[in-house]
Structure formats: structure tokens, C-alpha cells
């Protein structure tokens, strides 16, 4: 039950990448507006995105306070121009979101190869440590700061001219690999959280190849 012409939100969905977290829902409002509330399991409700006609709400500022907590959100529906109006039970219509634990569920963003440097038959490949919106002591933490050794990177590398491809893995942001002298190689990396069963991997990084400006070659 609810106020005439007011419908409850549905299909509440968390969209989260590297902890940037947005709650989305349906339907597009017709003569109604929405307010979102978010809470931890044991905490108080906090209102966000007051009386909005959007069907999304950025909840990043709330979830980054503790990314290992489990959060629940709810979306309230109000008649447009009459937000004090409530349902027959004395409350506005609302719908609950699924629970969301950022540390376990945020998608891993596409990584970027920061640089590669060849010294003789060794190449050092460095993955950019992306900054997140998670803060500690007024400083934004990197993905590695947040996940520590729970995050690994897989490097794929291959000779530009070959159908062969090799792999290395690291729980830091650096790889040191052996290459054949005088050959040009291409590189791609992928972020992985081995302890997860879902949202386990990122998409592959853009491919970077030797002979392009990101790399450096030194003959020793």
C-alpha cells in the first residue's frame, strides 16, 4: 500500500569499481521523487540523495568509511511536490537493496601498465597502483594499500612476432621477467583477488609493447 500514484523502487543494484560505489534502481520517476538511506548492519540509517529524480545515488563517501563492513540501503518513494505524504501505514513506500560488502564485492578496475624497463635480458614491468577514494589519516589509499597481499596481478607477455605467450604473477605491483635479447615484447596485466569466487578478476589492461614510449631500454 502507498500514496496514490507512488510506486516502490525495484531492481536495486550496487555498481562498484575500485570502491567508487553507486546504487541504481528503477523506475524512472513519474510524479515522484526518491531519497536513499544507507546503514551498516549494526548502525543508524543515514539519508543521501534527498528527494531526487535520479535513479542512482553515489554512496562512495559512506562505504569508504569501512570497506569491510556490510551495508544495506533502502530507497524511499515520495509523491513529487508532497514529500510529507506517506503510505497508509504512516510511512513512505521503500524497497531494500541487497547487502553489499565493498571489500568482497567491488569490481576491480582495468589496470594500467605504468612502465617497463629492459636491462639486458631482464624486463621490469610496473603496474600503476591506482588511487581509491578510501581514506586513512586524510590520505587517499591506493588499491594495494587497501587489499595488501589479497590482490595479485597476472602479467601476460609475448613476442610481437609470435603466437606464443607466457605468464607471471606477483603480489606486489612489479614483475621481473626474462626475455630474449633483441626481441620486442608486448605486455598486458590483469588484477585478481584469489580469495574471491565472484568479481575475482579485472578486465585486461591495454596492451603495451616495447618500442613505444612507456618503455626504456638499457644495454648492459
Amino acid at each position: 500500500s502507498g500514496t496514490t500514484n507512488t510506486v516502490a523502487a525495484y531492481n536495486l543494484t550496487w555498481k562498484s569499481t575500485n570502491f567508487k560505489t553507486i546504487l541504481e534502481w528503477e523506475p524512472k520517476p513519474v510524479n515522484q521523487v526518491y531519497t536513499v538511506q544507507i546503514s551498516t548492519k549494526s548502525g543508524d540509517w543515514k539519508s543521501k540523495c534527498f528527494y531526487t529524480t535520479d535513479t542512482e545515488c553515489d554512496l562512495t563517501d559512506e562505504i569508504v568509511k569501512d570497506v569491510k563492513q556490510t551495508y544495506l540501503a533502502r530507497v524511499f518513494s515520495y509523491p513529487a511536490g508532497n514529500v510529507e505524504s506517506t503510505g497508509s501505514a504512516g510511512e513512505p513506500l521503500y524497497e531494500n537493496s541487497p547487502e553489499f560488502t565493498p571489500y568482497l564485492e567491488t569490481n576491480l578496475g582495468q589496470p594500467t601498465i605504468q612502465s617497463f624497463e629492459q636491462v639486458g635480458t631482464k624486463v621490469n614491468v610496473t603496474v600503476e597502483d591506482e588511487r581509491t577514494l578510501v581514506r586513512r589519516n586524510n590520505t587517499f589509499l591506493s588499491l594495494r594499500d587497501v587489499f595488501g597481499k589479497d590482490l595479485i596481478y597476472t602479467l601476460y607477455y609475448w613476442k610481437s612476432s609470435s603466437s606464443g605467450k607466457k605468464t607471471a604473477k606477483t603480489n606486489t605491483n612489479e614483475f621481473l621477467i626474462d626475455v630474449d635479447k633483441g626481441e620486442n615484447y608486448c605486455f598486458s596485466v590483469q588484477a585478481v583477488i584469489p580469495s574471491r569466487t565472484v568479481n575475482r578478476k579485472s578486465t585486461d589492461s591495454p596492451v603495451e609493447c616495447m618500442g613505444q614510449e612507456k618503455g626504456e631500454f638499457r644495454e648492459i
Epitope: I152, K165, K166, A168, K169, R200
Partner: antibody, heavy 116, light 106 residues
Amino acid sequence: QVQLKESGPGLVQPSQTLSLTCIVSGFSLTNYNVHWVRQPAGAGLEWMGVIWTDGKTDYNSTLQSRLSISRDTSKSQVFLKMNSLQAEDIATYYCARDWDTGFDYWGQGVMVTVSS
Amino acid sequence: DIKMTQSPSSLSASLGERVTISCRASENINNILAWYQKKEDGSVKLLIHYTSNLQSGVPSRFSGSGSGKDYSLTISGLESEDIATYYCQQAYTPYAFGAGTKLELK
């Protein structure tokens, strides 16, 4: 559910070519890498090679000169071809799915004997 | 290439006993280590990946630990269904397995 099943001749003549097929179900070959592993009688597991999601390959250097791995993504099949078979190639051959930090599903294995 | 040295090659233990198998890599493998169980019927099962992550469906009596070059698999209380050969594996190219540890009942 995820399954891998190896098939091929149980008997190969010396110096001939071994051809094995791994039929997979429950996942796509464009999303998961597939490896071949073998176990000679009385010995341990030996990694042979892999076909990556993009169709590129990597082989154990000791087998590289006579090993080839390919696939047919539309039929969900991975193929192993190894030539110049000898007695030391007598083994159980497995295909396995790569889960980044381990091989999470394995076929039941196919026993291959080399004899004239 | 990274080589894996597993020990012991075989061991006998009683039901309920705590069993530990060791694996040493020839260089630092950054915890990229898996453990497998191979039964007499030929079936192979992933037990633990990334040093200590228990694969779904594997009993909690199995655990893994280690870092750098040295790793171990522990069975906290041996059960009859655990009689098998155990292998460690590093997941760098070229992938390599340890030689195996055959676990038997005392």
C-alpha cells in the same frame, strides 16, 4: 556444471603422433585458459602446455619441439598433438581449467601406451 | 625456470594424526602456490590455491601456509578419504609441480 573430458587412442605406435581431444562444458574457452598435464607411470605430474583465452599458447620447453595445442571454440574442444612418441611418453594425460592461482577442474584423464 | 622440491616423498600416518607436507621453490614465488590431491582412481582435485585459500568444498581440516620460497600443507586430523598423493605447484610460466608426497595409513 563445469566438466572436462579427454578422449583419444589408448595405444600409439612408436615414432607416431598422439592426438587427444578435451571436450569442455559449463564454461567458455574464450574466458578460461586450458592446460594439458601428464603423469607417467610411477612419476609425478608434469605440466605440458596451455592454450590461453586468446588462442595463444605456451609449452614446456622440454616438449616444445614436438607439441602443439589448438582449439575449436565453437565446439568447446581443445586439441593436443605430440609427435615422435616414445616409451617415455607412456602416461595418463589430463586437461585442466586454469583459475589463475590453480587448476580448479580436471578431466578424468586418458591413459596412453606407446607400443608396436 | 622455477623448480619445486617437495618433502617427504612418502609418509605413513594414523587416522586422526596431524600431517604436514613441505614444498620449497627455487626462488621467491610470491605465494603463488597451489596444492592438489590425486587419488588412486586418477582423479585430481585442487585443495588450496594462493598458499592458503581453501577451494570451495574442501574440508576445513586442510590448510596451507608459507611465504617466499617455503610452503606447507597441513591436514589437522587425518581421515581415511585423505589417503592419496599430494602435489604442490607454482603458477609461473613454465608451471611446475613438486614430485609428490604419497600419504599412506600406518
